[in-house]
Interface confidence: medium
């Protein structure tokens, strides 16, 4: 079976079932309802989840039991459209069960929510999750695929049973261990750190498809795919990028049993072929399905072949430039960005993007012209500013934050977005700046020819969060123009933004500024998102503050928490001297 | 040594349709993708439609998008276009050739089958 099966099965539900296996089944339809309707009780989705798997079954059966030949969508839309609270729970969700399929399928769509009105998860002690663990086992791992479906709601929905597997295993050895938070805690931190991540690259790859359409992210695909594969020619490319298109396609729309199938099948594909991709998938296709495809994903660049010949023989030089641009424009066009991203691991796909689209725009310009050949002889000299900019803007930052560190990195950044679209909610501009400041620590450290690849795609990802949570409910039309208007030339935009002069500042209110005991009592991290709150709110009440103004407040305000922190009577001396710091704040920054 | 002969050109009149074969021997054909290339009456060369080792994805030039089809039989180590709703500018030599392993060169081609729409 390729990827492309075109074979008609009677029974879509039955075919999937047998394909995927009962267990991978049941756990990609939960992730799927969790992922649509998230704010139903975990039992709801359980007791949905089983009568789909039991009709399943009877499909498997007999693929001709009635209702058996029914699309997925069908079959999985009128069961959630049985939920009894659905116009309680999800107010206008709730008239997407009125249309037909496909309509209701885009409907439910639609009403995703990347940022859903849910209580934070908080990490119950070890011995209680041990025995929770060892009490019910599959119950367990339910809740853990539902909680993290429900909170991202575009995660990609076969690496999440990856992630299963890997929560499982970290029970399964840290529960036994002599010190089992020693064992167990760092596995878990790490797995949220990697899952947070995870869904944020999926966001942005759903974000490319749906808001840009296939041919963005099928260019995406060529770029990082020829800079991954280097060897590949670019028919195998091209291969690769349609099944792994029609994959993201999928799994996007919600088509995650397709889309988990297809996924195994292109895993299944690639180690068959390997000679012909690259020399660094052995150890990946060694390993059982679910690590192989993450690995696969995962891999490092193959070596880029000896004496590849100069570009500018086929795609400047040549006569027949035009007439093949002509011909075919997009395969020209992939031909163009298969041959520089192979030659160029150092460049981010983004930037590759933006060179092809030169090209491209060069092109369309120059074969119309009376003079071919002579128009476009030079397209190669206006890639030289779109190189160094990305690079220039690297140093810089890198040089910023081995001077500050991650924290006063994240705060020089707070700053810096805070004054460039203050309009934004204080939660949004905290999350993504502190996510932006986290390029330093994964980045800088690497040489200078991944640290472009590193950085800007990694911007990609946390701008495309800023995108998508704006988009929700927007405030800032100059966020909108940068989310809009190209996805490779977001983070130049938003780069380019400088200080809003349109802003009129808010209104100062001590009650933002006022702090408790409980403050003493809050992880490092959670801590300094409190301080890093109360610094987006006074750029906000004082956007033409200086940087020595600011620093002088926060470096008073770490004082106040550290000294109150330290009291015998917290509560009364966070009164007493919050009062006095909000007094010489005002007067510090002229409120 | 590789060899590429195609067959399936003829005389047909505009609107008409013919079915072009190309038998491959000499390489791995399983592993190689393919395409079709033309050359009209004193033109230059124009490629035509390209087609992957696994029978997928295909490709195809603007000018004869929805009227040809690409397709291959990799058990029989022959290569198939089926073109349709000819016009009298589909009228040139058609040749298969072995894709290019990445630059805009092809490796192998065959002698070619002309084909002629003409009322």
């Known amino acids: 079976r390729g990827v492309f099966r075109r074979d008609a099965h009677k029974s879509e539900v039955a075919h999937r079932f047998k394909d995927l296996g009962e267990e991978n089944f049941k756990a990609l339809v939960l992730i799927a309802f969790a992922q649509y309707l998230q704010q139903c009780p975990f039992e709801d989705h359980v007791k949905l989840v089983n009568e789909v798997t039991e009709f399943a079954k009877t499909c498997v059966a007999d693929e001709s039991a009635e209702n058996c030949d029914k699309s997925l969508h069908t079959l999985f839309g009128d069961k959630l459209c049985t939920v009894a609270t659905l116009r309680e729970t999800y107010g206008e969700m709730a008239d997407c069960c009125a249309k037909q399929e496909p309509e209701r399928n885009e409907c439910f769509l639609q009403h995703k929510d990347d940022n859903p009105n849910l209580p934070r998860l908080v990490r119950p002690e070890v011995d209680v999750m041990c025995t929770a663990f060892h009490d019910n086992e599959e119950t367990f791992l339910k809740k853990y695929l539902y909680e993290i479906a429900r909170r991202h709601p575009y995660f990609y929905a076969p690496e999440l049973l990856f992630f299963a597997k890997r929560y499982k295993a970290a029970f399964t050895e840290c529960c036994q261990a002599a010190d089992k938070a020693a064992c167990l805690l760092p596995k878990l931190d790490e797995l949220r750190d990697e899952g947070k991540a995870s869904s944020a690259k999926q966001r942005l790859k759903c974000a490319s498809l749906q808001k840009f359409g296939e041919r963005a992210f099928k260019a995406w695909a060529v770029a990082r795919l020829s800079q991954r594969f280097p060897k590949a020619e670019f028919a195998e490319v091209s291969k690769l990028v349609t099944d792994l298109t029609k994959v993201h396609t999928e799994c996007c729309h919600g088509d995650l049993l397709e889309c988990a199938d297809d996924r195994a099948d292109l895993a299944k594909y690639i180690c068959e072929n390997q000679d012909s991709i690259s020399s660094k998938l052995k150890e990946c296709c060694e390993k059982p399905l679910l690590e192989k495809s993450h690995c696969i994903a995962e891999v490092e660049n193959d070596e880029m072949p000896a004496d590849l010949p100069s570009l500018a023989a086929d795609f400047v030089e040549s006569k027949d430039v035009c007439k093949n641009y002509a011909e075919a424009k997009d395969v020209f066009l992939g031909m163009f960005l298969y041959e520089y991203a192979r030659r160029h691991p150092d460049y981010s796909v983004v930037l590759l993007l933006r060179l092809a689209k030169t090209y491209e725009t060069t092109l369309e310009k120059c074969c119309a012209a009376a003079d071919p050949h002579e128009c476009y002889a030079k397209v190669f000299d206006e890639f030289k500013p779109l190189v160094e900019e990305p690079q220039n803007l690297i140093k810089q930052n890198c040089e910023l934050f081995e001077q500050l560190g991650e924290y006063k990195f994240q705060n020089a950044l707070l700053v810096r977005y805070t004054k460039k679209v203050p309009q934004v909610s204080t939660p949004t501009l905290v999350e993504v700046s502190r996510n932006l400041g986290k390029v330093g620590s994964k980045c800088c450290k690497h040489p200078e020819a991944k640290r472009m690849p590193c950085a800007e795609d990694y911007l990609s990802v946390v701008l495309n969060q800023l995108c998508v949570l704006h988009e929700k409910t927007p405030v800032s039309d100059r966020v909108t123009k940068c989310c809009t208007e190209s996805l490779v030339n977001r983070r130049p935009c938003f780069s380019a933004l400088e200080v809003d002069e349109t802003y009129v500042p808010k209104e100062f209110n001590a009650e933002t500024f006022t702090f408790h005991a409980d403050i003493c009592t809050l992880s490092e991290k959670e801590r300094q998102i409190k301080k890093q709150t109360a610094l987006v709110e006074l750029v906000k009440h004082k956007p033409k503050a200086t940087k020595e103004q600011l620093k002088a407040v926060m470096d008073d305000f770490a004082a106040f928490v550290e000294k109150c922190c330290k009291a015998d009577d917290k509560e009364t001396c966070f009164a007493e001297e919050g009062k006095k710091l909000v007094a010489a704040s005002q007067a510090a920054l002229g409120l | 040594e590789v060899q590429l002969l195609e067959s399936g050109g003829g005389l047909v009149q505009p609107g008409g349709s013919l079915r072009l074969s190309c038998a491959a021997s000499?390489?791995?054909?399983?592993?190689?993708?393919m395409l079709w290339v033309r050359q009209a009456p004193g033109k230059g060369l124009e490629w035509v439609s390209v087609i992957h080792q696994s029978g997928t994805p295909t490709y195809y030039a603007d000018s004869v998008k929805g009227r040809f089809t690409i397709s291959r039989d990799n058990s029989k180590n022959t290569l198939y276009l089926q073109m349709n709703s000819l016009r009298a500018e589909d009228t040139a030599v058609y040749y298969c050739?072995?894709?290019?392993?990445?630059?805009?060169?092809?490796?192998?081609w065959g002698q070619g089958t002309l084909v002629t729409v003409s009322s």
């Open positions: 000499g390489f791995t054909f399983d592993t190689s993708s």
């Open positions: 050739a072995k894709f290019p392993s990445s630059r805009m060169k092809f490796d192998y």
